[in-house]
């Protein structure tokens, strides 16, 4: 067989589908690898061929499109399962070719089982809702293309094992689930089950997503530096260890990059010669507000180090702030014997 541009196994597209449910899988060639679409390819006389390698096998084999009730079929650039079986798991290849051109890509397909509460090894998308922000909606994902617009499916929403009905602040509205006012108690996994008829058969599509209730932009503030502050003075003798924590609170902000850094005499610690280490820890509140702590440490501080300016800086999409630490050299207490001697007029 002549040379074929082989894009290898596209593990970025780890496709997971539920057992005993319909699945439509588009050939990734047209979405991610080639600069033309299926229609262009088809009208140019190119043919799309599908084959697969079963799980734990090396042998590539053609896909059987002659199964009862057309369980597996191909339509344009889509491979259809109506429905999937557990042993459909494997690596699938779509190859576009004619006598002069060939391009192919493989991708893994995993058919997974779910239990009665929709728990499964499926990786779940996360949808963030703002706390106490007014009506917000989530939509049953990835159901386009399964049935024509003339078909009116029934949609049932669940939270875990339980059908969403009579909830205080959550209302199912067809493909949408409306949260009248999102609260922490609304955190969790939500499942929509879409049921539709096709050729005298009934199919179910199950889609689960995780809802995470996060801080509202209405309540967001610029970073708040809790430490250093004006109430704490870092008073050290030369030779002692200097430890200064910079603790900053960041409101949750969607897609915001939170940054904390120290400057010493206006320079980044990496740009100066003193032996300084910085350790960072991060914690999150239940609404994903963030507290970052960076501890600046100088093992054996010198009197020169104690004269420097140590400033903690913080930045988020809401603004930038800075706070200097109060550092000073401890004045040694007068030695007892000297003081006593002077008191008695000794020379």
């Amino acid at each position: 067989s002549e040379r074929c541009d082989d894009w290898g196994l596209d593990t970025m597209r780890q496709i997971q589908v539920f057992e005993d449910e319909p699945a439509r899988i588009k050939c990734p060639l047209f979405e991610h690898f080639l600069k033309f679409n299926y229609s262009t390819a088809h009208s140019a006389g190119l043919t799309l061929i599908w084959y697969w390698t079963r799980q734990d096998r090396d042998l590539e084999e053609p896909i059987n499109f002659r199964l009862p009730e057309n369980r597996i079929s191909k339509e344009k650039d889509v491979l259809w399962f109506r429905p999937t079986l557990l042993n459909d798991t494997g690596n699938y290849t779509c190859m576009l070719r004619n006598t002069t051109y060939c391009s192919k890509v493989a991708f893994p397909l995993e058919v997974v089982q779910k239990d009665s509460c929709f728990n499964s090894p499926m990786k779940l998308p996360v949808h963030k809702l703002y706390i106490e922000y007014g009506i917000q909606r989530i939509t049953c994902p990835n159901v386009d293309g399964y049935f024509p617009s003339s078909v009116k499916p029934t949609i049932t929403w669940y939270m875990g094992c339980y059908k969403i009905q009579n909830f205080n602040n959550v209302i199912p509205e067809g493909m949408n689930l409306s949260f009248l006012i999102a609260l922490i108690s609304n955190n969790g996994n939500y499942t929509c089950v879409v049921t539709y008829p096709e050729n005298g058969r009934t199919f179910h599509l199950t889609r689960t997503l995780t809802v995470k209730v996060v801080g509202s932009p209405k309540n967001a503030v610029p970073p708040v530096i809790h430490s250093p502050n004006d109430h704490v003075v870092y008073e050290k003798e030369p030779g002692e260890e200097l430890l200064i924590p910079c603790t900053v609170y960041f409101s949750f902000l969607m897609d915001s990059r939170n940054e904390v850094w120290w400057t010493i005499d206006g320079k980044k610690p990496d740009d100066i010669t003193i032996d300084v280490t910085i350790n960072e820890s991060i914690s999150h509140s239940r609404t994903e507000d963030e507290t970052r702590t960076q501890i600046l440490s100088i093992k054996k501080v010198t009197s020169e180090d104690l004269k420097r300016s140590y400033v903690c800086h913080a930045r988020s999409a809401k603004g930038e702030v800075a706070k200097a630490a109060k550092v000073k050299q401890k004045v040694p207490a007068p030695r007892y014997t000297v003081e006593l001697a002077c008191g008695f007029g000794a020379t």
Epitope: S116, C117, M159, K163, N166, F167, S185
Partner: antibody
Framework: QVQLVQSGAEVKKPGSSVKVSCKAS????????IQWVRQAPGQGLEWMGY????????DYAQKFQGRVTITADESTSTAYMELSSLRSEDTAVYYC???????????????WGQGTLVTVSS | EIVMTQSPATLSVSPGERATLSCRAS??????LAWYQQKPGQAPRLLIY???TRATGIPARFSGSGSGTEFTLTISSLQSEDFAVYYC?????????FGQGTKVEIK
């Protein structure tokens, strides 16, 4: 350690109502459901309905629709089951039960209350 | 609603012997089946869920098997504390339903 403590035995007249309480201690922060199940003398177990206290969601078995009301007071971690229009065949031990979360398949009756005997007699 | 049928209604077994209890569903419940033990004057106790997974603290002599419509609870060597009534319950479809119970008594 999560525990469910139910209210004491009741004797009721036919046609009246009974309200049984179920107080949860050591409740987790995550939402959970309280189930109600009854058992007539010498008979099997019969599921009546559930409530999710923190979310307000509830559902009842078809057989009890219109006669049963399940409520909850989140502030006291207490669920209630009220059965109206009582008849002699409602004489039973009424149990509440729960799981740790809303997500554990098959473990929604993990922890049980001690049961409340309701006797309906004229 | 799914009807759960248990057999036998009563099982007479000597201590140390094996007991096999059956539960049949009127339609497939996959592996969404639980078993409970109930002693006189006590609330039921969860033994098995997912047809074969032992609940926390349940001894290894209790085992469950089956899927679809036919299920079995086996007690490999009956102890005196195992004489009780056993119920199966499906949680595949609402409403969740229980079997009528099997009483395991001393022979």
């Amino acid at each position: 350690q999560v525990q469910l403590v139910q209210s004491g035995a009741e004797v009721k007249k036919p046609g009246s109502s009974v309200k049984v309480s179920c107080k949860a201690s050591g409740s987790p922060a995550e939402p959970y459901a309280i189930q109600w199940v009854r058992q007539a003398p010498g008979q099997g177990l019969e599921w009546m309905g559930y409530i999710i206290p923190s979310l307000g969601g509830y559902d009842y078995a078809q057989k009890f629709q219109g006669r049963v009301t399940i409520t909850a007071d989140e502030s006291t971690s207490t669920a209630y089951m009220e059965l109206s229009s009582l008849r002699s065949e409602d004489t039973a031990v009424y149990y509440c039960a729960r799981g740790q979360t809303l997500y554990e398949s098959g473990r929604q009756f993990d922890i049980w209350g001690q049961g409340t005997l309701v006797t309906v007699s004229s | 609603e799914i009807v759960m049928t248990q057999s036998p209604a009563t099982l007479s077994v000597s201590p140390g012997e094996r007991a096999t209890l059956s539960c049949r569903a009127s339609q497939s419940v996959s592996s969404n089946l639980a078993w409970y033990q109930q002693k006189p004057g006590q609330a039921p106790r969860l033994l098995i869920y997912g047809a074969s997974t032992r609940a926390t603290g349940i001894p290894a002599r209790f085992s469950g098997s089956g899927s679809g419509t036919e299920f079995t609870l086996t007690i490999s060597s009956l102890q005196s504390e195992d004489f009780a009534v056993y119920y199966c319950q499906q949680y595949n479809n609402w409403p969740w339903t229980f079997g009528q119970g099997t009483k395991v008594e001393i022979k």
